[in-house]
């Protein structure tokens, strides 16, 4: 006859393990007994648990209540066991020892393996802002055993640098994504993905990107000149502008103060029937936690009845 | 025929000491693990001590542990148990007995000896 | 220390009775049970191992049964030489421990 078993056998930390040992006899062969013992190298053989043809199982008392029968039905000639919730501590070497009648005694070897599976932990990096150098977005931590696999899965172009720490039964990798901040790269997703022979499918961790940044200011409604003359209803100037944080905006006039009857509505003024005492000089001041952008115009508003045009200046300024 | 022969017990004064032996013969002593068991008066069984087939091998019940000793002379077919400060609560039949299995647990005591009768009163 | 308990403490049957004696371990044992006969002033003599072999030797009506902390010792039809106190036995851990007797008395 002969024993059948596993060179490995892999678990998962937290799930049973199968430990097989069966023994293929001759016709009219009996198992009186098969001793598991764990063996690892340099330390001596420590019984797990004992099973008996006639006494049935023996479960030593430092594996209590961790070792059992497969559940039934069972073939007498199979000496397996499980091990109940498998730790890291439990990887090594396993040793079957089949007491046979009349063919004697046979022995097999086989190695567990407790995979770890990762908890992977993603670090956003500093305040990202619009004109820096090579800057850290994030790092991505997974320790377990074996070392997992960290990756990054972004459309966002940057480079990645890894490095790996090693612990007595485990492994902790850790990936940083770095990147030159620019605002095409706001509300992007940087996900973190963690392979690992003990997770089912990847783990992902998913960051979106902010980039502070503050665009150029600009301001819209005097394109038609025409339009701003004496008694005209619905004038109004809009300051464009975009950020990250989004801006607040303030309006101002550079030779006095707003007219009365002028509305400031945050990035809008409105103005009431235009009279010649609304012609000057108005500034956008567009801010947010990044910067500052002005935008001034001029604005003139014509008499009808007088013949000069009507003159119109836009100055942008930062 | 396995026989089992239990002797050197009497009457002895607390804090006295005694030695027990047991002739084995009938079957190849050195194969087999070896116990004493006692049963005090009118009470039941109590295992006191057990040595496996080589010298080293031996456990104890806490109620005797550091003040009895067990012992096999292989080349005699021969136990001993070497019983130290005896106090009156270790009066008692003391009879030896063979295991059917050489180790720690699991095994039967198949065949005994007739007992010797120990006590221990001032 | 596992404890073995046994019931009943005795009884008295009659010869040709059937009778049933029980042991329950303080927690699971296998199969890692004997069951010994003592007569007065007799050494004990094994009966049962491995909770239901039966000792070569004995008559075929004693029968064990049982696994993991019940156990019962049956005696088909009693016979006069019967009469005599039962133990049961762990042999799963150190110290191994008996329960403590049941005496069979004639009726």
């Known amino acids: 006859g002969e024993l059948e078993t596993s060179d490995v056998v892999t678990v998962v930390l937290g799930q049973d393990a199968k430990l097989p040992c069966f023994y293929r006899g001759d016709s009219g062969e009996q198992v009186g007994q098969v001793a598991w013992a764990r063996v690892d190298a340099g330390e001596g053989a420590q019984e797990l648990a004992l099973l008996h043809s006639k006494y049935g199982l023996h479960v030593s008392p430092a594996y209590e209540g961790r070792v059992e029968q497969p559940p039934p039905p069972r073939n007498p000639l199979d000496g397996s066991v499980l091990l109940r919730n498998a730790v890291q501590a439990d990887e090594g070497e396993y040793e079957c020892r089949v007491s046979t009648f009349p063919a004697g005694s046979f022995q097999a070897r086989l190695r567990l393996r407790v995979l770890v599976p990762p908890l992977p932990s993603l670090n956003p990096g500093p305040a990202l802002e619009e004109g820096q150098g090579l800057t850290l977005a994030a790092s991505c931590t997974a320790e377990g055993s074996p070392a997992p696999s960290v990756t990054w899965d972004t459309e966002v172009k940057g480079t990645t640098s890894s490095r790996s720490f090693k612990h007595s039964r485990s492994a902790a990798v850790t990936s940083e994504f770095h990147l030159v901040p620019s605002r095409s790269m706001n509300g992007q997703p940087l996900t973190c993905v963690v392979s690992h022979p003990g997770l089912l499918q990847d783990q992902r961790i998913t960051h979106i990107l902010h980039v502070s940044f503050l665009a150029e200011a600009s301001v819209r409604g005097l394109e038609d000149q025409n339009l701003w003359h004496i008694g005209r209803e619905g004038a109004m100037l809009k300051c464009l502008s975009e950020g990250q944080p989004p801006p607040s905006y303030n309006w101002t006039r550079l030779d006095g103060p707003l007219p009365s009857g002028v509305r400031v509505d945050g990035d809008t003024l409105g103005f009431p029937p235009l009279t010649t005492e609304h012609s000057g000089i108005y500034v956008c001041h567009v801010s947010n936690e990044f910067s500052s952008r002005d935008s001034q115009v001029t604005v003139d508003v014509l008499d009808p009845q007088e013949d000069s045009g009507k003159q119109v200046d836009l100055v942008s300024a930062s | 025929e396995v026989q089992l022969v239990e002797s050197g017990g009497g009457l002895v004064q607390p804090g006295g000491s005694l030695r027990l032996s047991c002739a084995a013969s009938?079957?190849?002593?050195?194969?087999?693990?070896m116990s004493w068991v006692r049963q005090a008066p009118g009470k039941g069984l109590e295992w006191v001590s057990r040595i496996k087939t080589t010298d080293d091998g031996k456990s104890y019940a806490d109620s005797v542990k550091g003040r009895f000793t067990i012992s096999r002379d292989n080349s005699k077919n021969t136990l001993y148990l070497q019983m130290n400060s005896l106090r009156a609560e270790d009066t008692a039949v003391y009879y030896c007995?063979?295991?059917?299995?050489?180790?720690?647990?699991?095994?039967?005591?198949?065949?005994w000896g007739q007992g010797t009768l120990v006590t221990v009163s001032s | 220390d596992i404890q073995m308990t046994q019931s009943p403490s005795s009884l008295s049957a009659s010869v040709g009775d059937r009778v049933t004696i029980t042991c329950r371990a303080s927690q699971g044992i296998s199969s890692y049970l004997a069951w010994y006969q003592q007569k007065p002033g007799k050494a004990p003599k094994l009966l049962i191992y491995a909770a239901s072999s039966l000792q070569s030797g004995v008559p075929s009506r004693f029968s064990g049964s049982g696994s993991g902390t019940d156990f019962t010792l049956t005696i088909s039809s009693l016979q006069p030489e019967d009469f005599a106190t039962y133990y049961c036995?762990?042999?799963?851990?150190?110290?191994?421990?008996f329960g403590q007797g049941t005496k069979v008395e004639i009726k």
């Open positions: 036995q762990q042999h799963y851990t150190t110290p191994p421990t």
């Open positions: 009938g079957y190849t002593f050195d194969s087999y693990a």
């Open positions: 007995a063979r295991q059917t299995e050489d180790r720690s647990y699991g095994y039967d005591l198949d065949y």
